[in-house]
Every structure is written in structure tokens, then in C-alpha cells.
């Protein structure tokens, strides 16, 4: 649930976390031939005042952080989201059982920031 | 606090919310001449399964949503963040009390999505 992630005290600042995703776990093993999985990674952490340059905060996120300080019930903190994403190439079967090599964009998190 | 935003039951799907920001409220009235404020807006809402086309989810966010379903304690849901941002032009005093017109990028949220 979302409540697993609501404690500022326990959360570190927004950053990239490592995550390997198995296509079998997603139930995609019947159509994806290769790879068996990939390092997808994910973003998590607080975007709290004071922000710093390591947090890759957009100007809007900076403004939103200041508004959140004044109105925490009304405006949420910015969220920790990917700032750089990479593609992966996947070998798969199409509807006609042909083997296709396709590049899927925005599959791997390379960097995170406050947005 | 972050806990103000942790109830899935109360939250609608990820979308843009209207927000007007006054530069006086931010304490910037001494250097910004005009405008007095601007429509910054912000993103908020759930990025829950099932995602749909209105949520502008990246491929990574789709994968992360599925992983979250299997491991909710380990991997968070994707977050609702700006997908399109606009600049604003600001008239301000520089160090030498000259009046300058400057365009600040990524200040206004135009659209939101799951990231």
C-alpha cells in the first residue's frame, strides 16, 4: 500500500535504487525470448526542503517544495521520478510466431530527480 | 507531511491540479518586479493498476506498477509527475539594480503522468 512509503523519518533523499525484473515474474515468458529479465531500477526517496543539486529538482519542483512548506495539507511535496531513461532490446514472438527484435524505449532508470 | 497523501481510497488518479503561486508568499517580492505570481499548477494522484492511456505512463512506470503489485513493501508505485512544463518570463532587479527580463524554464505544469 501507499502507506509503506509515507514516513519522512525513515526515508532517505530521492535517489535511484537497483531493481532486477524477471520477465517470468511478470508472466511475459511466453512471448519474450530474450533477455530473461533486465535491470529496470526505480526511483524512491523524499523531495523535502532543503533541496540540493544532487536531487535534480526542476524549477517547478523547487517552487512546489516552498508552497508545500507553507501549505502541507493542500499541496504535496514533489515526487521522486526518473530524469533519464534508457531503452532495452527484446527478442520476442509476434502474433504470427515470427521472431522479432524490437527496441522498447524508457525501460531502464538511469537517474532520478525531484519533479 | 507525506502522510497527508497516503490514502489510496481518498486519492483520484494522477492528474494536473490548478495552483496559483504568489511571489510575495515565497518571499521573492524584493527581486521580482513582475508578474506578482503565476499559475504554476501541480501533479497529484494515484498511479495504480490498471494504468490507462490518460495517465501518460512510461514503459518503465508500467513495469514498476506490475512489480509493485507483486512486492508492494519493496517497490513503490510510480509517482505522478509533470510530463510537460512551460517557461515563464520574469522582470527582476539584478545585482546592480538593473531591470532584467529573464525566461525561467520548467516553471508551469501543463500535463502530468505516471513516472
Amino acid at each position: 500500500s501507499a502507506s509503506d512509503y509515507n514516513s519522512s523519518e525513515l526515508k532517505t533523499a530521492c535517489r535511484k535504487h537497483e531493481l532486477y525484473v524477471s520477465f517470468q515474474d511478470l508472466g511475459w515468458q511466453d512471448w519474450i525470448i530474450a533477455p530473461k529479465g533486465y535491470a529496470a531500477n526505480y526511483c524512491d526517496g523524499e523531495c523535502s526542503f532543503p533541496l540540493n543539486a544532487h536531487m535534480n529538482a526542476t524549477n517547478h519542483a523547487i517552487v512546489q517544495t516552498l508552497v508545500h512548506l507553507m501549505n502541507p495539507e493542500y499541496v504535496p511535496k514533489p515526487c521522486c521520478a526518473p530524469t533519464k531513461l534508457n531503452a532495452i532490446s527484446v527478442l520476442y514472438f509476434d502474433d504470427n510466431s515470427n521472431v522479432i527484435l524490437k527496441k522498447y524505449r524508457n525501460m531502464v532508470v538511469r537517474a532520478c530527480g525531484c519533479h | 507531511s507525506a502522510s497527508d497523501y497516503n490514502s489510496s481510497e481518498l486519492k483520484t488518479a494522477c492528474r494536473k491540479h490548478e495552483l496559483y503561486v504568489s511571489f510575495q508568499d515565497l518571499g521573492w517580492q524584493d527581486w521580482i518586479i513582475a508578474p506578482k505570481g503565476y499559475a504554476a499548477n501541480y501533479c497529484d494522484g494515484e498511479c495504480s493498476f490498471p494504468l490507462n492511456a490518460h495517465m501518460n505512463a512510461t514503459n518503465h512506470a508500467i513495469v514498476q506498477t506490475l512489480v509493485h503489485l507483486m512486492n508492494p513493501e519493496y517497490v513503490p508505485k510510480p509517482c505522478c509527475a509533470p510530463t510537460k512544463l512551460n517557461a515563464i518570463s520574469v522582470l527582476y532587479f539584478d545585482d546592480n539594480s538593473n531591470v532584467i527580463l529573464k525566461k525561467y524554464r520548467n516553471m508551469v505544469v501543463r500535463a502530468c503522468g505516471c513516472h
Partner: nanobody, 121 residues
Framework: EVQLVESGGGLVQAGGSLRLSCAAS????????MGWYRQVPGKQRELVAA???????NYGDSAKGRFTISRDNAKNTVYLQMNSLKPEDTAVYYC???????????????WGKGTLVTVSS
């Protein structure tokens, strides 16, 4: 560019007080917040306290209840009043300013050179 100059560091006995000052000059108009961080050799810089232009503050765990941050917008100066100092407060204290990103996409940090605070027991 923003230039930051710290002053007020020095040697003080445990239980004593110090007041650090940080004067900002240069492109100060786009500064969003100013603050103090500290670092001891071999450890990461940690937040002591920060303050926005509107006066909102945040304190690191080590500073709560003992340190107070304030700012004088007219003088472009931020202060850190440190009371009930302990030997473990010994560190180099750095002034930080954080501003809107221009012309780039992300916010920008500026740092002072640091001022040494030594608390003897």
C-alpha cells in the same frame, strides 16, 4: 554566480555559544534558500539548518533545540546561533545557497569555503 563568505567560527568550550554568519553576493536574486551544513573528516556533509526567503526553516537532528537559523534579507546574510555546544559539534561548517536553475533544467547549489568550529571539553 553567487559568492558566499562565512565568518564566526573558532574555539569554544563545551556548553558555550557561537554565532556564524554567511554573507551572499553576486546573483543573489534567484536564491531560494540558504543554509548551513557541517562535515567532519571521513564523513558526509550533513544538514544543520536551512531557511527560505519567506522564513520557513528546517533543522537537522543534531541542531534541533540548540541551534537557530535566521536571515537578514536586506543584508543578504544568514546566521546560525549555536548554543549548548558539545565536543561532537566540532566540524567545518559550510554555508550553502540553493537557487532556481538558469539556463539549465535543475536547481543550482553554491557553497562557501567553510569555517572551522572547535568545541573543547
Amino acid at each position: 554566480e553567487v559568492q558566499l563568505v562565512e565568518s564566526g567560527g573558532g574555539l569554544v568550550q563545551a556548553g558555550g555559544s557561537l554565532r556564524l554568519s554567511c554573507a551572499a553576493s553576486g546573483s543573489i536574486f534567484s536564491i531560494v534558500s540558504m543554509g548551513w551544513y557541517r562535515q567532519v573528516p571521513g564523513k558526509q556533509r550533513e544538514l544543520v539548518a536551512a531557511i527560505t526567503s519567506a522564513g520557513s526553516t528546517n533543522y537537522g537532528d543534531s541542531a534541533k533545540g540548540r541551534f537557530t537559523i535566521s536571515r537578514d534579507n536586506a543584508k543578504n546574510t544568514v546566521y546560525l546561533q549555536m548554543n549548548s555546544l558539545k565536543p561532537e559539534d566540532t566540524a567545518v561548517y559550510y554555508c550553502n545557497s540553493y537557487g532556481l536553475g538558469y539556463p539549465g533544467d535543475y536547481g543550482i547549489d553554491y557553497w562557501g569555503k567553510g569555517t572551522l568550529v572547535t568545541v573543547s571539553s
